[in-house]
Interface confidence: low
């Protein structure tokens, strides 16, 4: 071992450096001292450090470490925060479009229903938004409430418009009859399945992204232990006590110190990897009825079909309801259902193919690809931090925590450190409580993500086929399908171009007697070109 170089005879360099950390020189010896009170930078000879300086170095070292950790996670944190915000906003926009399409369908096809239909549609989509954001709302109840509310209005306005106001207490009976007589056929059940599956997946996707932010925030703001502070001080600052201002720590030594300091954080690695892979699996399955964009933007069409189903069976229904709700109705009123030949009994629900621009689906896949580049983020952290702090290349002529060495030897360094602190002991302490908590949250979300991962291939439930509904003609290579209607496929040019303004607000919503209903902008109308005889809301 080469002897330590003689310290600066006046401690001048140390004084000028330390003054940058702590204005005032009262703690810095003018000339080297024995340093018998030092606890971290244990001297092999005279030293330019005092106990107070050591404490300041420890504080600075821990702050440096926190800053390095924060800059290490900055890109990842920004990626998740930005995407969580983008997706949350995008989902709100999808909900708004879906509401507008549905309102437009009512306005154009069933104007007599509009004042109240707008209200029910508004309430339904409000609940959809709240559910996505985590509210404790039952999707089946939402759908039931929509159809329960719609049927009395359909019955009194379309099927039996002669009904006087005095007979309005028929509503309660009509709500009950709606379910008992399955007046909308299997459409409510179809919508329940599609909406609940797609919203569940959407909700957990957002939850997972928000947890990702929480994980990064937790590790970003970790307070490092005193032991770690001592190790960092020894690595970064103890060389100064010997007047070695330009010497860099050995790379191998830095890795050992960082692994010791980050032992708890690195424990997240296993669960973080699983989180990204589970999220990828979820995203890969978010298509057809598991894609809220497809499901919600196609709802207007399914609701339209459901009303046609009622109208088709209006004759039979009016008679049955007349008997069923006789106590609410003194006499039968003229029935105004449409001639049956106007309606096609569709056994197969056609599905619509969405033309890709920048869809939510492609945005999700892009996010997963970027996240996968951070899959080893936690296991690579010690190495990352060492590579972003000053270390000697090739471990030659570098500081090993005690002295300047020509070549770093981990074994020698460990032996030399034995009496000062125990790296192994530092690792054995286990993660901090906050890290343990975040690991538990990761375990929980990973479990949820796994249970939510969708089957590949045909995804529409068999139980929806009872009344001849089928999943339609979407091939496996087409991963954007909407439960639609009509005799041909609806071509829906995708609305969600992320960098576009996206402020489309048809706003035929919510109020009875809205005298200022805006019409869709021209570019929105062109969205529904070449529709043939399909029931587009904007025709």
């Amino acid at each position: 071992q080469p002897p330590p170089p003689p310290p600066d005879a006046t401690c001048h360099q140390v004084r000028s450096f330390f003054q940058r950390l702590q204005p005032g020189l009262k703690w810095v010896p003018e000339t080297p001292v024995p340093g018998s009170d030092l606890q971290v930078c244990l001297p092999k000879g005279p030293t330019c450090c005092s106990r107070k300086m050591e404490e300041k170095y420890q504080l600075t070292a821990r702050l440096n470490m926190e800053q390095l950790l924060q800059s290490a996670s900055m890109e990842l944190k920004f990626l998740i925060i930005q995407n969580a915000a983008v997706f949350q906003e995008a989902f709100e926009i999808v909900v708004r479009h879906a509401k507008n399409y549905t309102n437009a369908m009512f306005k154009n096809n069933y104007p007599s229903l509009t004042p109240q239909a707008f209200e029910f549609v508004g309430e339904f989509f409000t609940d959809v938004s709240l559910y996505i954001l985590g509210s404790d709302i039952n999707v089946d109840d939402m759908v039931n409430e929509l159809f329960d509310s719609l049927f009395p209005v359909i019955y009194t306005q379309l099927m039996n418009p002669g009904l006087p106001d005095s007979a309005l207490d028929i509503n309660e009976c009509l709500r009950g009859a709606r379910r008992d007589l399955k007046v909308f056929g299997n459409f409510p059940k179809l919508i329940m399945t599609q909406v609940s599956k797609s919203l569940q997946v959407t909700r957990i996707f957002l939850q997972a992204l928000n947890l990702g932010i929480e994980v990064i925030n937790t590790t970003d703001h970790l307070k490092f232990s005193k032991d770690c502070g001592r190790m960092l001080t020894r690595m970064w600052y103890c060389s100064y006590c010997q007047g070695l201002m330009m010497v860099k720590p050995c790379g191998g030594y830095c890795n050992v110190v960082m692994q010791g300091c980050m032992a708890g954080v690195v424990e997240i690695d296993k669960y973080w990897r699983e989180y990204i892979l589970s999220l990828e699996e979820l995203v890969n399955g978010m298509y057809r009825i598991y894609d809220m964009e497809n499901v919600l933007l196609g709802l207007f069409s399914t609701i339209h079909d459901s009303i046609q189903y009622v109208q088709k069976n209006a004759g039979k229904l009016t008679t049955t309801i007349g008997k069923l709700c006789a106590h609410s109705q003194q006499r039968q009123y003229r029935s105004a259902y449409y001639p049956e030949d106007l309606f096609i009994d569709k056994k197969v629900l056609k599905v619509a193919h969405v033309e890709h621009e920048e869809t939510l689906s492609s945005r999700r896949r892009e996010l997963i690809q970027k996240l996968k580049s951070f899959i080893s983020f936690y296991s690579a952290l010690p190495g990352y931090i060492c590579s972003h702090s000053p270390v000697a290349e090739n471990d030659t002529l570098c500081w090993n925590g005690q002295e300047l060495v020509e070549r770093y030897s981990q074994k020698a360094a460990r032996n030399g450190m034995k009496n000062q602190f125990n790296l192994h002991e530092l690792k054995m302490k286990g993660p901090e409580p906050v890290v343990s908590q975040i690991i538990d949250k990761l375990k929980h979300i990973n479990q949820l993500l796994r249970t939510m991962s969708m089957p590949k291939g045909r995804v529409l439930d068999k139980n929806l086929d009872e009344e001849g509904f089928e999943s339609g003609d979407c091939g496996d290579d087409e991963d954007e399908c909407i439960g639609g209607s009509g005799d041909g496929m609806i071509k829906v040019k995708n609305q969600l171009r992320f960098l576009a303004e996206l402020a489309y607000d048809l706003d035929v919503d919510d109020a009875p007697g809205n005298s200022q209903q805006a019409t869709p902008k021209d570019n929105e109308i062109s969205t529904f070109h070449n529709l043939g005889n399909v029931h587009s809301p904007l025709k």
Partner: antibody, heavy 119, light 112 residues
Framework: EVQLVESGGGLVKPGGSLKLSCAAS????????MSWVRQTPEKRLEWVAY????????YYPDSVKGRFTISRDNAKNTLYLQMSSLKSEDTAMYYC?????????????WGQGTLVTVS | DVVMTQTPLSLPVSLGDQASISCRSS???????????LHWYLQKPGQSPKLLIY???NRFSGVPDRFSGSGSGTDFTLKISRVEAEDLGVYFC?????????FGGGTKLEIK
Amino acid sequence: EVQLVESGGGLVKPGGSLKLSCAASGFAFITYGMSWVRQTPEKRLEWVAYISSGGANTYYPDSVKGRFTISRDNAKNTLYLQMSSLKSEDTAMYYCASLSTLVRGWFAYWGQGTLVTVS
Amino acid sequence: DVVMTQTPLSLPVSLGDQASISCRSSQSLVHSNGNTYLHWYLQKPGQSPKLLIYKVSNRFSGVPDRFSGSGSGTDFTLKISRVEAEDLGVYFCSQSTHVPYTFGGGTKLEIK
């Protein structure tokens, strides 16, 4: 024509109870979310309670939570407000009003009001 | 709770004049869905309030087009282009973006 007619107001002692009713006609009551709004003697308006169209959801501001209960009987086209543990600051004209939904509602139609005096 | 502040408290006008009432909220009324739920009501003497304008600028059914609403975020205005005798009364602004719903203190429109 939409009509909302409140009743049940009157003079009551602090700590007492009162039940207000609102009879609706001229529209499909069952399909509307409903609210009670009160107007203080100083003419300030305060939202008091909300119930969704099917009656499944109710909401109250903190000032009345635990003391007031909103309910509806869709068969009778009637809205109710059960008020208990009344305080002098509950003195107001109470209006029933129809609205769309909690998150995006506005009070489209109002009754003529019923006066509650707590003294 | 969101505090709604109306100015002026009283607004004396001559018939045929333009009137303008201001309403300011203590926080933004832009809902996460992009809509702004700021509404205006008129209470004529001896009557219950009536809805005039919903969502900043939409006139309710039967409301004359001399009434218009504008504004965004936290600052909103109700304008009456030519005041008529039947417009006299107390005007209230109200928000339903945040629960609980809250109202402004009112602005009394009266004849000079």
